[in-house]
Structure formats: C-alpha cells, structure tokens
Interface confidence: low
C-alpha cells in the first residue's frame, strides 16, 4: 500500500461527510485535507467512523498542530478525544468550561480514564482554582472526583464552591480530605439557621473538631448513626455521655449495635460506667465506679 499515496481521481474530499466511512485508511490519509478536517471537526462526531479511521484523522491533526490543538478543534473532537493520549492532552490549553463539558460527555458512563484525569488537571491548573461552575460540572460527571484530590489540591477549593457538593460526592473521602473540606463548608454555610445548617454540614462532619460537635449537641440536631460513625475518633472521645445523647437524640439507641466499632468502642472505654448506664442501653466497658480518670493530654500540657 506504500505506492498508493496519491488520492485516486474523484476521491478528494470536498467536505467531511458520511461518504468518508467507506474510504480505506490510505485513502483517508491521501484524500482528506488536514485543514478541512480542522474546520469541520464538528461533523466527525456525527459520522460513525471505525477506530482505525479515527486513528488516521488524529494523525492528520497531529501533523497540522504539532504543538497541540487549538481550542476550536478540541471542543469538537467528540469520539476522537478517546484516541488522545495524556501526552497529547498536556499540549492543550483548555480554558472554556463548554469545551470541558463536551469532552467529558464523550467519556460519560466510563470510568475516569488517564486522558480525562489529564484534561481536568490541565483545565483546573489553567483556572488557578476549582471554582463552583467547574466543580459542579466535574462532580456531575464523576461523583467521586472531589475525593480523588489530595488534601493539597483540595486546599485550592474556594468555600463558595462547596455549595456545589452533594453528599454522595464525599462518600469515598478519607479523614485527611474532610479535615480540609470541613472548615470551608463551615464558612460557606455559616449564615444558615440551625436545622438547615446541619443538613448542609452533615456530610462534612468527618472533619469536625470536638468543640463543633459539642456546639451541635446543643442544637437538637438528631444526628444519625451513619454520620456519627464517620466522625473523627479523636473528636468524639472527649464528648460526655450527655453530649452524645443530645447529639444523637432518638438515634442514641443505635449505639448498642455499634459498641464494638470505632469510634463508639473507643468512646465507651473513656466514659464512666455509671454515666453509660443512664442511657439504659446495656453498654459495657466503661470505667468502673471508684476509679480515678486521669486526662493524660491535660497532664502533658501542664508539664
């Protein structure tokens, strides 16, 4: 096929249309002008080319734009985006949210690929921070996106963007990530009233310190056990039995089912058995009556 480099008579493409899916690879290479392809990229996605044909089209664009594609081409890549390597994408300068959405749409339903991860990274770095619109878009396509970021990366999320976060977006976040996100959420929702505030802040409470949990216990919030089990152990340990009872409200009965699991198990070990007995749940493992409880952390602070 090496000698078949000239375009056969009458086969020169005048426009990008359906007839091209019947071209052999070498005919596409010889008969489709790269500049024509670049100006009519929006049509490529409407034509069911085979992947082998898409490889040829990509090769033509690569030759035309060795330094990276312009955004006008990138926005209309469609299925051709799936042919791009992370190395290709690193050459791009994507600034438009519409371009990002168009490319994420192509990958919709598939797991986040290295290409998509690189694209998002390029886009966010170009913007300087994860603004609300970007976060809205990314979490709509990839609910786990936020939890895939490092604590350092999360630090660039402005508090205003937290409004875009849904509870399921935080499902896979670990405590280190919630430690970064919680203060931002607290700031974002600070002007809401008690019950509304709790609904919004609830998903972020895995990063809350003891003093904030104590404050919540005074507000009749009725925290569910699932949320309680995600709290930081070190934040739960200093809470008194009375504070936990107020914090959980009617859900306090659920402690019995969780008494062998953290943070409930560790919290029980720190409480006086007398106090635990007041709950009437049969929780065992508290400090027996007559024992002196030394708060070692306080002792260390004084020495």
């Amino acid at each position: 096929e090496v000698e078949k480099t000239a375009c056969p008579s009458g086969k020169k493409a005048r426009e990008i249309d359906e007839s091209l899916i019947f071209y052999k690879k070498w005919e596409l290479e010889a008969c489709v002008d790269a500049a024509l392809l670049a100006t009519q990229m929006d049509r490529v996605n409407a034509i069911p080319f085979t992947y082998e044909q898409l490889d040829v089209l990509k090769h033509k664009l690569d030759e035309l734009y060795p330094q990276g594609y312009p955004e006008s081409v990138i926005q209309h890549l469609g299925y051709l985006f799936l042919k791009m390597s992370p190395e290709d994408i690193r050459k791009w300068n994507v600034t438009s949210l519409e371009t990002l959405k168009a490319l994420l749409e192509v990958n919709k339903g598939h797991e986040m690929s290295p290409q998509v991860a690189t694209l998002i990274d390029r886009f966010v770095k170009g913007r300087g921070q994860l603004d609300k619109d970007t976060l809205d878009t990314l979490t709509a396509f990839y609910p786990g996106y936020l939890c895939s970021l490092s604590p350092e990366e999360l630090s660039s999320v402005p508090p205003s963007s937290i409004w875009a976060v849904r509870p399921q977006d935080l499902d896979t976040c670990d405590p280190r990530q919630l430690d970064v996100l919680y203060p931002k959420a607290r700031l974002a929702f600070q002007n809401m009233n008690g019950s509304e505030y709790f609904v919004k802040i609830q998903s972020f409470l895995g990063g809350a310190p003891t003093e904030d949990l104590k404050a919540l216990s005074q507000q009749n919030v009725s925290m569910d056990l699932a949320t309680f089990m995600k709290l930081r152990t070190d934040a739960v340990l200093p809470l008194t039995v009375a504070e936990v009872q107020k914090l959980l409200g009617p859900h306090v009965e659920g402690l019995k089912a969780e008494e062998r699991h953290r943070p409930v198990r560790d919290w029980i070990l720190r409480q006086r058995q007398d106090d635990l007995d007041t709950l009437g749940l049969g929780l065992q493992g508290g400090i027996p009556n007559g024992y002196l409880v030394l708060d070692l952390s306080m002792q260390e602070a004084l020495s």
């Epitope: 409407a46 069911p48 085979t50 992947y51 299925y79 799936l82 598939h110 690929s113």
Partner: nanobody, 116 residues
Framework: QVQLVESGGGLVQAGGSLRLSCAFS????????MSWYRQAPGKQRTVVAS???????SYADSVRGRFTISGENGKNTVYLQMNSLKLEDTAVYYC??????????WGQGTQVTVSS
Amino acid sequence: QVQLVESGGGLVQAGGSLRLSCAFSGTTYTFDLMSWYRQAPGKQRTVVASISSDGRTSYADSVRGRFTISGENGKNTVYLQMNSLKLEDTAVYYCLGQRSGVRAFWGQGTQVTVSS
C-alpha cells in the same frame, strides 16, 4: 470471552427480504459502534451499515433505502433488515462491535445468497 454471533442468513430470491441478527455475549459493557460488513468472493470486506450507541446510523450508497440497521444496545443485539435484495448483495455478512479503549470484535459471519 467476548463473542459476536450472526444469524439469519440464507438463500433468497432477488427482490426478497432477510433479517440478520447479531447477538454479543461475554461482556458487561455495550459497544460505542456496531456495524455490518460484507465480503463477496474475491472482494475486500466493506462496511454496509453502522449504528452508534446513541442511535446514529450510516449506510453505504449501494444499500441506502433498502437496508435498515437497528439495535438495542442495552439488549446486546443489532439487526440488519435487508429488503429488495439484489444479486450483488450475495456475500458473507459480518458483525463488528467496537468500543473505545477495547479492540474491535468480529463475528464469524453468516452467508447471504441471492438467486435469480
């Protein structure tokens, strides 16, 4: 093991109809693009019709208006309704499934013979 199995081929008189089916199994995903190709004796395999996962279709000029490709991607089957068959439609018809990041999968083919 991904398998594409074609059926529905056979001997038919010119002007008659056939409906080819392609069922794929052994995969939990759906294909981005399903196509029917054909290969006549001594000729290259060429694409006849294609359907994308969102329902876009495309046809070779020689079959447009006579053949209809359809499919329910979620049900893992694609069809080729062939009407007004001509002698030159005689060929082995192959099903092709393609998905991004995954190689293309071919079926074994089903023979269609149009007689006068």
